[in-house]
Interface confidence: low
């Protein structure tokens, strides 16, 4: 039986140019990670695996860097990074739990977070 | 089973045009950039590029820009590799490779290109 | 030609300790994991080391590798006939924004 819950930073806005954290967290199991996927609609970012650490696929590599902890820092925004962003924790012997970010990059200098919420 | 097969070997003339496959299959085709390597008769293995299935994003080996054209057809989990003018120097062994973490982890068989007139 | 450097050839006798050595710069080995290939005659080249140290399942704990600066080397123990094959390196270049191969180093077991 699955028990844990994802916890991540929700809907998130940031500034054209700027960087965001990408933040997911995995609690209330104790299941344990054996790696972390993180993608943006149908396409791989960066993956964290336990044994291996940290791959960012090659069309992020300039853009993306790796933490902190099993997060990831969106770096030089444009607005073409607005949309859905998932984390997916791969865990034995649980299975896969996946959390969801929505991202807004604005034109404007006014980019205020979201509220944290829970996706179980 | 994760295999890449690719399509069998040509001989074509001069001038010829040809594409030249790379079938993936027993994973997920979109999450893996796909590369191709050329290996010309008793030499070493260049690497010609990469591109990535999902949105057909290419990096391309200097050497090998605007030489070739490499492309995806995510519907099919297919990936190719094309020329529109062939040379005598482009005889050799083509092989396509998945990608995870760096290294080309899994590999086609090959498909040997062998141009003569 | 290769942006990694390697010795052409390589040989030992069954049972030794072989090494191949792998040369290149800040911009590759320098600041990215290196990568072995084994290509035995006639076939495919097969991933035999990555990320420096690791080996993919399969791969026998007689091959290793290590990495300083900017050279990397794969050492084979307990050497076999079946080790009788070209080996090369690889890693990401980030000057390129693609990998560079070495020129390969073939392997003779005497």
């Known amino acids: 039986m699955m028990t844990g819950t994802i916890e991540t930073t929700g809907n998130i806005s940031a500034e054209k140019g700027g960087s965001i954290i990408l933040q997911c967290h995995l609690s209330s199991t104790t299941a344990q990670v054996t790696q972390v996927n993180w993608e943006q609609q149908d396409q791989l970012l960066a993956i964290c695996n336990a044994d291996l650490g940290w791959h960012i696929s090659p069309s992020f590599k300039d853009r993306v860097a790796p933490g902190p902890g099993l997060g990831l820092t969106l770096q030089s925004l444009t607005v073409n990074d607005t949309g859905e962003y998932f984390c997916i924790y791969h865990t034995y012997p649980d299975g896969t739990y996946t959390g969801r970010i929505f991202l807004e990059v604005l034109e404007s200098s006014v980019a205020e977070h979201g509220a944290r919420f829970q996706i179980p | 089973e994760v295999q890449l097969v690719q399509s069998g070997a040509e001989v074509k003339k001069p001038g010829e045009s040809l594409k030249i496959s790379c079938k993936g299959s027993g994973y997920s085709f979109t999450n893996y950039w796909i590369g191709w390597v050329r290996q010309m008769p008793g030499k070493g293995l260049e690497w010609m590029g990469i591109i990535n299935p999902v949105n057909s994003r290419t990096i391309y080996s200097p050497s090998f820009q605007g030489q070739v054209t490499i492309s995806v057809d995510k519907s099919v989990t297919t990936a190719y590799l094309q020329w529109s003018s062939l040379k005598a120097s482009d005889t050799a062994m083509y092989y396509c490779a998945r990608y995870y973490y760096y290294a080309m982890e899994v590999w086609g068989r090959g498909t040997l290109v062998t141009v003569s007139s | 030609l290769p942006v990694l450097t390697q010795p052409p050839s390589a040989s030992g006798t069954p049972g030794q300790r072989v090494t191949i050595s792998c040369s290149g710069s800040s911009s590759n080995i320098g600041s990215n994991t290196v990568n072995w290939y084994q290509q035995l005659p006639g076939t495919a080249p097969k991933l035999l080391i990555y990320r420096n140290n690791q080996r993919p399942s399969g791969v026998p704990d007689r091959f290793s590798g290590s990495t300083s600066g900017t050279s990397a080397s794969l050492a084979i123990s307990g050497l076999q006939s079946e080790d009788e094959a070209d080996y090369y390196c690889?890693?990401?270049?980030?000057?390129?924004?693609?990998?560079?191969f070495g020129g390969g180093t073939k392997l003779t077991v005497l």
């Open positions: 690889e890693a990401w270049d980030d000057s390129l924004n693609g990998p560079v």
